[in-house]
Interface confidence: low
């Protein structure tokens, strides 16, 4: 037998004591579904969150931080502060990134630098608390004859020997 | 038919928790929400929170921080999970099915908390 | 929050009477307000939902009327086995809230 209720639109609930009444979701509620037996209340999008889009019958509010926040956990359901670059939010507020870590953005924790000479490589450009450093090339790249980070040679015409 | 059936009270110590459960039959937690609700030994009703088919959560302001409801869609079960308990939680507890425009049509039994040392 | 005051906190009457509970809301809550009853030992069941719609099952004796503020709950005809404490409930904002009760005694 198939339920009454299936037959209630999202945007609806099915009301039990109206003979399976298909109602409409009451004020600040919703149905994103067919078949529910209750609208679900909206989200209401207070204090350091806002509203992205607004709540209506059939689908629910979506917030957005407040500038100087961010979103965390899933649809938005936390705002964590904002830091600079070259921070970290501790639970003492934001703190500069320790020596050799650093956070280019302006959430996250601070990372440590990549550390080069595990890939044989020099360190090229050094790291600061915003940016990593920036590995060189391998004493090996360096070695005559190597050509993994020597500009390509111009092209040659032929019948022309190198100068 | 439609049952719910509360579990897990008990004795507990001020300062313990608790977790309680509900467990439903005869229709969906995906389609229906589920309250909790206490009265004390001689007093009234009062209402603690609510779970929504899609997994919301509305808690009264008195109880905010202390107390958090969940449920397994699977299990047809609805959890009330409190903390820091005192004396004045000494209840009996409720869990009741919202339906419609929010009203509870069905009730359990209820399930008796006593917190005391 | 909405504080929900019932009015009288008990009261006895003799079958047959016509008894008339009332609830006063502290703000308007568009008739966003349900009816429970408890007897002795029980648990709770509902009558009224949304001021005036009769919840199934439930006798005819019962009825519910109001808007705004202020709500009534109407036993026509009392029964012996309507001996309870009556409960109504706003849904109109959160948190929920319910009235204080109010015990109903056979005279």
């Known amino acids: 037998l198939q339920d009454p209720c299936s037959n209630c639109p999202a945007g609806t609930f099915c009301d039990n004591n109206r003979n399976q009444i298909c109602s409409p979701c009451p004020p600040n509620s919703f149905s994103s579904a067919g078949g529910q037996r209750t609208c679900d209340i909206c989200r209401q999008c207070k204090g350091v969150f806002r509203t992205r889009k607004e709540c209506s019958s059939t689908s629910n509010a979506e917030c957005d931080c407040t500038p100087g926040f961010h979103c965390l956990g899933a649809g938005c359901s936390m705002c964590e502060q904002d830091c600079k670059q070259g921070q970290e939010l501790t639970k003492k507020g934001c703190k500069d990134c320790c020596f050799g870590t650093f956070n280019d953005q302006k959430r996250g924790i601070c990372r440590p630098w990549t550390n080069c000479s595990l890939d044989g490589k020099s360190v090229l450009v050094n790291g600061t608390k915003e940016r990593d450093v920036v590995c060189g090339p391998s004493p090996a790249d360096l070695s005559p004859g190597a050509s993994s980070v020597t500009p390509p040679a111009p092209a040659r015409e032929p019948g022309h020997s190198p100068q | 038919e439609v049952q719910l059936v509360e579990s897990g009270g008990g004795l507990i110590q001020p300062g313990g928790s608790l977790r309680i459960s509900c467990a439903v039959s005869g229709f969906s937690l995906t389609t229906y929400a589920i309250s909790w609700v206490r009265q004390a030994p001689g007093k009234g009703l009062e209402w603690l929170g609510i779970?929504?088919?899609?997994?919301?959560?509305n808690y009264a302001d008195s109880l905010k921080g202390r107390l958090t409801i969940s449920k397994d869609n699977s299990k047809n079960t609805v959890y009330l999970q409190m903390n820091s308990l005192r004396t004045e939680d000494t209840a009996v507890y409720y869990c009741a099915r919202g339906a419609g425009t929010w009203y509870f049509d069905v009730w359990g039994q209820g399930t008796l908390v006593t917190v005391s040392s | 929050d909405i504080q929900m005051t019932q009015s009288p906190s008990s009261l006895s009457a003799s079958v047959g009477d016509r008894v008339t509970i009332t609830c006063s809301a502290s703000q308007g809550i568009s008739n966003y307000l349900n009816w429970y009853q408890q007897k002795p030992g029980k648990t709770v069941k509902l009558l009224i939902y949304?001021?005036?719609s009769l919840h199934s099952g439930v006798p005819s004796r019962f009825s519910g009327s109001g808007s705004g503020t202020d709500y009534t709950l109407t036993i026509s005809s009392l029964q012996p086995e309507d001996i309870a404490t009556y409960y109504c409930?706003?849904?109109?904002?959160?948190?929920?809230?319910f009235g204080q009760g109010t015990k109903l005694e056979i005279k």
């Open positions: 779970i929504w088919p899609g997994g919301g959560t």
């Open positions: 949304y001021t005036s």
């Open positions: 409930q706003q849904y109109s904002k959160f948190p929920w809230t």
